[in-house]
């Protein structure tokens, strides 16, 4: 069985042959303020092996194609503004360019 936060992408009858991170974020992780570029923001990186980078929810539910892969799954979103954070420590992101 895949760990929590993972999904079985290829499975045999009674076992999973390949687990990948579940590619859809929980709803509460998706709502990021649109004005965040105007101030310094600190993001908590998700624990490794849990959820992937999350994209804002598309307004009309059917987003145009995207070419950025998440593991072996691909995401469609109107706004691909996610910032991959490879560590589990908080990372301060500044929009001032300094």
């Amino acid at each position: 069985e895949c760990r929590p936060g993972m999904i079985c992408a290829t499975s045999a009858t009674n076992s999973c042959a390949r687990c990948v991170p579940y590619p859809i974020c929980a709803a509460e992780t998706v709502t990021k303020p649109q004005d965040m570029a105007e101030k310094d923001t600190t993001f908590e990186a998700p624990p490794l092996g849990t959820q992937p980078d999350c994209n804002p929810t598309p307004e009309n539910g059917e987003a145009p194609a995207s070419t950025s892969p998440t593991q072996s799954l691909l995401v469609d979103s109107q706004a691909s503004k996610t910032l991959p954070i490879p560590t589990s420590a908080p990372v301060a992101l500044s929009s001032t360019g300094k």
Partner: nanobody, 122 residues
């Protein structure tokens, strides 16, 4: 209890299109994330696409740009539009509810509905 019925499969020539439907009953709200899986003859069960309750969509590499998933929450129905079909898309297609919870282990093909056969052949 959640029950699913898949439909819309058939025999189609390479390059053709189909629209699969998955009608659900037993949900108490707009429904959870929904996934489409498929199993080709003699192969393992393979994740194809997922759609969230609010319409965010995800596809596996092999169908990206050819398949489109959508949902009609009012009718408790999820659709999978299959375009530019190729012989390797031949499989039984199944939908699965709440794959985050239900598709972590074992086989996610055929647990909730009978599936619908898609055959791509000239």
């Amino acid at each position: 209890e959640v029950q699913l019925v898949e439909s819309g499969g058939g025999l189609v020539q390479p390059g053709g299109s189909l629209r699969l439907s998955c009608t659900a009953s037993g949900f108490t709200d707009d429904g959870p994330d929904m996934a489409w899986y498929r199993r080709a003859p003699g192969n393992e069960c393979e994740l194809v696409s997922i759609i969230s309750a609010d319409g965010r969509t995800y596809y596996t590499d092999s169908v990206k740009g050819r398949f489109t998933i959508s949902r009609d929450n009012a009718k408790n129905t999820v659709f999978l539009y299959l375009n530019s079909l190729q012989p390797e898309d031949t499989a039984v297609y199944y939908c699965a509810p709440d794959p985050r919870r239900n598709c972590r282990g074992g086989d996610c093909c055929g647990n909730w509905g009978p599936g619908t056969q898609v055959t791509v052949s000239s």
